[in-house]
């Protein structure tokens, strides 16, 4: 082992370096001193450090560590924050378009039901937005609300047009009759199933992304313990006390120190890995009735089919309701069975197949691929931080916390440390309370994600069978399937090609006419490709 270089006889170098950390020189000895009061940089001989300097070094070391940690997580944090914002905005756009498609369907096919239908549709989609953002709304209640509100208007405007105003007090009876007589058939149940499944998954996806941000924010702003501060000081600054200004810590030594300092943080690793893999499973399952884009953008068709179902049974219904609500309505009924102009042109329900466009679905998969590159983020943190702070190459001629060594030996370093504080003890303390809390939250979201990520062979078609629809309505060979009445089915691939234009809005007044009902025109549409660059909250 080489003899230590002669200490700086005047502590001049140490003084000039320390002045950069702390203006004023009152704490720096002019010449080396015994340093008997030092607690971290325990001297083997005269030293250029004082107790006050040591305290300042500790503070600086902990600040450095926090900055290193923040820069280590910056890319990951940006990735999740950006995507959480993009997806939330994209989901809001889907809801807005779904509302406008539905309003356009009413305007084009049932003008007599507007503006009341617009009001009910608006309230329904407001509830959808609230639900996605985490409000405690029951989806079945939302759907029941929509049909409860629509039926009195359908009955009084379509089935019994010309009902006198005095008869409008039958609305309450009609609301009750709607459920009792199942006037919309199984369509409300079908919509409940589709909407609840797709929104549940969407909501949990957003919750998971927001928790990801919380995890990074928590570990980003960790305050390191005093013990850690002492270890970091010894690694980064104690060499200065001996006048060794240019010496770098040994790489192996840095790893040992970082593992000690980050023992609590590294405990997140297991749950973080599970989080990314569970999120991947969820995303892989977000298709068909588990894809809100697919479900919501096709709701207008299912609602249209449900109204057609009412109209097909108008004669029978009018008679039954006439008896049921007779006390509310003293008049002769005439059945308005299906006026010609109420038929929707079946051509408008055939939406063109769109291949290879980037959509929400591909955007989700892209996010997962990027997240997977960070799957070892927490276990790799100690190594990452050492590789991004000054350490000696190949562990030669480096600082081991006590002296300059030709070659770093972990065992020697550990023995040297034992007298001052126990590295093992530091590891055994367990994670900080905030880390424990975030681990609990990760466990919870992982549980939720696992619950939602059912096996690939989801019981989708079985569910539809139970609701009384033929299994042919939604076969596995179909790309996407919305609606239940064959004629009114829309097959749509990758609907959201317009999401790059986050401000794009299809007003009801600008809604396409019957010839291409509620289907965005290709030339109005730009791809979703640059969405990541549009609304970056960190720019």
């Amino acid at each position: 082992q080489p003899p230590p270089p002669p200490p700086d006889a005047t502590c001049h170098q140490v003084r000039s370096f320390f002045q950069r950390l702390q203006p004023g020189l009152k704490w720096v000895p002019e010449t080396p001193v015994p340093g008997s009061d030092l607690q971290v940089c325990l001297p083997k001989g005269p030293t250029c450090c004082s107790r006050k300097m040591e305290e300042k070094y500790q503070l600086t070391a902990r600040l450095n560590m926090e900055q290193l940690l923040q820069s280590a997580s910056m890319e990951l944090k940006f990735l999740i924050i950006q995507n959480a914002a993009v997806f939330q905005e994209a989901f809001e756009i889907v809801v807005r378009h779904a509302k406008n498609y539905t309003n356009a369907m009413f305007k084009n096919n049932y003008p007599s039901l507007t503006p009341q239908a617009f009001e009910f549709v608006g309230e329904f989609f407001t509830d959808v937005s609230l639900y996605i953002l985490g409000s405690d709304i029951n989806v079945d209640d939302m759907v029941n609300e929509l049909f409860d509100s629509l039926f009195p208007v359908i009955y009084t405007q379509l089935m019994n047009p010309g009902l006198p105003d005095s008869a409008l007090d039958i609305n309450e009876c009609l609301r009750g009759a709607r459920r009792d007589l199942k006037v919309f058939g199984n369509f409300p149940k079908l919509i409940m199933t589709q909407v609840s499944k797709s929104l549940q998954v969407t909501r949990i996806f957003l919750q998971a992304l927001n928790l990801g941000i919380e995890v990074i924010n928590t570990t980003d702003h960790l305050k390191f313990s005093k013990d850690c501060g002492r270890m970091l000081t010894r690694m980064w600054y104690c060499s200065y006390c001996q006048g060794l200004m240019m010496v770098k810590p040994c790489g192996g030594y840095c790893n040992v120190v970082m593992q000690g300092c980050m023992a609590g943080v590294v405990e997140i690793d297991k749950y973080w890995r599970e989080y990314i893999l569970s999120l991947e499973e969820l995303v892989n399952g977000m298709y068909r009735i588990y894809d809100m884009e697919n479900v919501l953008l096709g709701l207008f068709s299912t609602i249209h089919d449900s109204i057609q179902y009412v109209q097909k049974n108008a004669g029978k219904l009018t008679t039954t309701i006439g008896k049921l609500c007779a006390h509310s309505q003293q008049r002769q009924y005439r059945s308005a069975y299906y006026p010609e102009d109420l038929f929707i042109d079946k051509k408008v329900l055939k939406v063109a197949h769109v291949e290879h466009e980037e959509t929400l679905s591909s955007r989700r998969r892209e996010l997962i691929q990027k997240l997977k590159s960070f799957i070892s983020f927490y276990s790799a943190l100690p190594g990452y931080i050492c590789s991004h702070s000054p350490v000696a190459e190949n562990d030669t001629l480096c600082w081991n916390g006590q002296e300059l060594v030709e070659r770093y030996s972990q065992k020697a370093a550990r023995n040297g440390m034992k007298n001052q504080f126990n590295l093992h003890e530091l590891k055994m303390k367990g994670p900080e309370p905030v880390v424990s809390q975030i681990i609990d939250k990760l466990k919870h979201i992982n549980q939720l994600l696992r619950t939602m990520s059912m096996p690939k062979g989801r019981v989708l078609d079985k569910n539809l069978d139970e609701e009384g629809f033929e299994s042919g309505d939604c076969g596995d060979d179909e790309d996407e399937c919305i609606g239940g009445s064959g004629d009114g089915m829309i097959k749509v691939k990758n609907q959201l090609r317009f999401l790059a234009e986050l401000a794009y809005d299809l007003d009801v007044d600008d809604a396409p006419g019957n010839s291409q009902q509620a289907t965005p025109k290709d030339n109005e549409i730009s791809t979703f490709h640059n969405l990541g660059n549009v609304h970056s909250p960190l720019k």
């Epitope: 309230e123 407001t126 029941n144």
Partner: antibody
Framework: QVQLQESGGGLVQPGRSLRLSCAAS????????MHWVRQAPGKGLEWVSA????????YYADSVKGRFTISRDNSKNTLYLQMNSLRAEDTAVYYC??????????????WGQGTLVTVSS | QSALTQPPSASGSPGQSVTISCTGT?????????VSWYQQYPGKAPKLLIY???NRPSGVPDRFSGSKSGTSASLAITGLQAEDGADYYC??????????FGGGTKVTVL
């Protein structure tokens, strides 16, 4: 004629319990969310609790959470508020109100006349 | 949950207009949520005047109108009449679907 009629109010000692009822008529009870709103003497309106039409979702103000329980019996067209661990600050006229909607709180289009609850020793 | 902010009082002469403001936060008035307005006479139950920010139930005179912008809503009464002297409350709900009322505004017809 849409009507709501509250009952069950009265004088009660602090720490005791009381159950309010609200009988509904003239509308399809199960289709609408229902609420309890209170008004302390000389003060403004304070929302207490709500329940969705199906009874599947319930909501409470922070001031009563854990002490009050809202419930409904759709077969009897009746809304209830079970009030436990009553405090002096719970003294108020309690109104039962019907929501315009079934899924959650929106606007209260029909109100009862209110029942006075006095909590005092 | 904290109450929405309303001015405690407002006044006007018959035939004049009065506007009552109601300020909330991004999680109640400013969100997707709707604002409603109620009129209450002393010793009586409140009556719904406006729902869904700007809709009037049948039977409410068109002198009453509501609007919402950002985190604020307002109720305008035009052509003030003696019977408009009452307390007025705004109401919305927060992101947890819990209802919030304003503190109330006493309107005096001079």
């Amino acid at each position: 004629q849409v009507q709501l009629q509250e009952s069950g109010g009265g004088l009660v000692q602090p720490g005791r319990s009381l159950r309010l009822s609200c009988a509904a008529s003239g509308f399809t009870f199960s289709s609408y969310a229902m609420h309890w709103v209170r008004q302390a003497p000389g003060k403004g309106l304070e929302w207490v609790s709500a329940i969705s039409g199906s009874g599947g979702s319930t909501y409470y103000a922070d001031s009563v959470k854990g002490r009050f329980t809202i419930s409904r019996d759709n077969s009897k067209n009746t809304l209830y508020l079970q009030m436990n661990s009553l405090r002096a600050e719970d003294t108020a006229v309690y109104y039962c109100a019907k929501d315009r909607r079934g899924s959650h709180a929106d606007a209260f289009d029909v109100w009862g006349q209110g029942t006075l609850v006095t909590v005092s020793s | 949950q904290s109450a929405l902010t309303q001015p405690p009082s407002a006044s006007g002469s018959p035939g004049q207009s009065v506007t009552i403001s109601c300020t909330g936060t991004s999680s109640d008035v400013g969100g997707y949520n709707y604002v409603s307005w109620y009129q209450q006479y002393p010793g009586k139950a409140p009556k719904l005047l406006i729902y869904g920010n700007s809709n009037r139930p049948s039977g409410v005179p068109d002198r009453f109108s509501g609007s919402k912008s950002g985190t604020s809503a307002s109720l305008a009464i035009t052509g003030l009449q003696a019977e408009d002297g009452a307390d007025y409350y705004c109401q919305s709900y927060d992101s947890s679907l819990r209802v919030v009322f304003g503190g109330g505004t006493k309107v005096t017809v001079l």
